[in-house]
C-alpha cells in the first residue's frame, strides 16, 4: 500500500540525506529512490497497543 510522502520532523528525524522531496534514502543501495519503492510500518509512539499502520516513507530518511 503506497501513499504520498509526508515530511518527517521531530525526535526521530535523522540527519538529512541529499534526497530531493518525494525521494527517500535507500540504505542498501546507498542512493535516493522514489519513496513509494520502499515500504514501512511507521512505528507509533511507545506505549501504543495496536499495530502500526502502513504508511508511505518519509522523504530524506
Amino acid at each position: 500500500m503506497r501513499r504520498g510522502p509526508r515530511s518527517l520532523r521531530g525526535r526521530d528525524a535523522p540527519a538529512p540525506t541529499p534526497c530531493v522531496p518525494a525521494e527517500c534514502f535507500d540504505l542498501l543501495v546507498r542512493h535516493c529512490v522514489a519513496c513509494g519503492l520502499l515500504r514501512t510500518a511507521r512505528p507509533k509512539p511507545a506505549g501504543a497497543s495496536s499495530p502500526a499502520p502502513r504508511t508511505a516513507l518519509q522523504p530524506q530518511e
Epitope: A15, L27, L37, L38, A41, R54, Q58
Partner: antibody, heavy 118, light 113 residues
Framework: DVQLQESGPSLVKPSQTLSLTCSVT????????WNWIRKFPGNKLEYMGY???????YYNPSLKSRISITRDTSKNQFYLQLLSVTTEDTATYYC????????????WGAGTLVTVSS | DIVMTQTPLSLPVSLGDQASISCRSS???????????LHWYLQKPGQSPKLLIY???NRFSGVPDRFSGSGSGTDFTLKISRVEAEDLGVYFC??????????FGSGTKLEIK
C-alpha cells in the same frame, strides 16, 4: 496486514536443491526488500539474501554461488533455491519483509523447518 | 561483516526480577546519516522473531514499557525491568547500519531459574 508464508519440502537429500516459496499477502513485492533468513539448531540466525523492488538481488557471500532468489510479481511470491545442500543446511527458513524507514525486519513468515538427510 | 557479540547466552531469572542483555558490535553502528540502526527481537518458543526495540531505544508498537534499550557506538543493552512469563524466549540484537549483510547476535535465552 502484511502476511508471509513459506512453503516447500521439509526433507531434502544431501547434494540436492532446496526450494522454498514465500507467498506475500497485504503488500506488493514490487515495493521494498524481501529477504530470506535461516535459524540453525542452537539459535544462530543467518541472513541469506534479498530480492528488491526492482528485482535486484543480494546474496550473503557465506553461501558462495549456491543461492538464488527469484520472484514472480504476478503471484506476489518470491523464491529461494539453495544448491548442493549438506546436513549443515538443516535449519528453520524464514522469509521476511524489511521496513525501509528504520531498516528492521517488520514482518516474518512462520518459518519452515528443512532437514537435510539421506 | 559486522560481528555482533551477545552476552550472556543463557539468562535464568525469577519472575519479577530485572534482566539485562548486552550486545557489542565489532564496529560503531552510527550511520553517516546520524542514525544508529541497532534493533532487538524476541523469538518466543514456536514463533518467528518479533521486533521489540528499534534504533537502540525505541519501543515498537505494543511493546510493554518494562522493556528498554540503551547504548551507543558499539555497546548496547536491553533491560527488562520486571520479567513476566510471556517474556521467555530467545532475544537477538541485530544491526542494519553496515549492510548488506544484516547481522545478528548469537541470541540470549531467557528462562525461569
Amino acid at each position: 496486514d502484511v502476511q508471509l508464508q513459506e512453503s516447500g519440502p521439509s526433507l531434502v537429500k544431501p547434494s540436492q536443491t532446496l526450494s522454498l516459496t514465500c507467498s506475500v499477502t497485504g503488500d506488493s513485492i514490487t515495493s521494498g526488500y524481501w529477504n530470506w533468513i535461516r535459524k540453525f539448531p542452537g539459535n544462530k540466525l543467518e541472513y541469506m539474501g534479498y530480492i528488491s523492488y526492482s528485482g535486484s538481488t543480494y546474496y550473503n557471500p557465506s553461501l558462495k554461488s549456491r543461492i538464488s532468489i527469484t520472484r514472480d510479481t504476478s503471484k506476489n511470491q518470491f523464491y529461494l533455491q539453495l544448491l548442493s545442500v549438506t546436513t549443515e543446511d538443516t535449519a528453520t527458513y524464514y522469509c521476511a519483509g524489511l521496513d525501509g524507514l528504520y531498516w528492521y525486519f517488520d514482518v516474518w513468515g512462520a518459518g519452515t523447518l528443512v532437514t537435510v538427510s539421506s | 561483516d559486522i560481528v555482533m557479540t551477545q552476552t550472556p547466552l543463557s539468562l535464568p531469572v525469577s519472575l519479577g526480577d530485572q534482566a539485562s542483555i548486552s550486545c557489542r558490535s565489532s564496529q560503531s553502528l552510527v550511520h553517516s546519516n546520524g542514525n544508529t540502526y541497532l534493533h532487538w527481537y524476541l523469538q518466543k518458543p514456536g514463533q518467528s522473531p518479533k521486533l521489540l526495540i528499534y534504533k537502540v531505544s525505541n519501543r515498537f508498537s505494543g511493546v510493554p514499557d518494562r522493556f528498554s534499550g540503551s547504548g551507543s557506538g558499539t555497546d548496547f543493552t536491553l533491560k527488562i525491568s520486571r520479567v513476566e512469563a510471556e517474556d521467555l524466549g530467545v532475544y537477538f540484537c541485530s544491526q542494519s547500519t553496515h549492510v548488506p549483510p544484516f547481522t545478528f547476535g548469537s541470541g540470549t535465552k531467557l528462562e525461569i531459574k
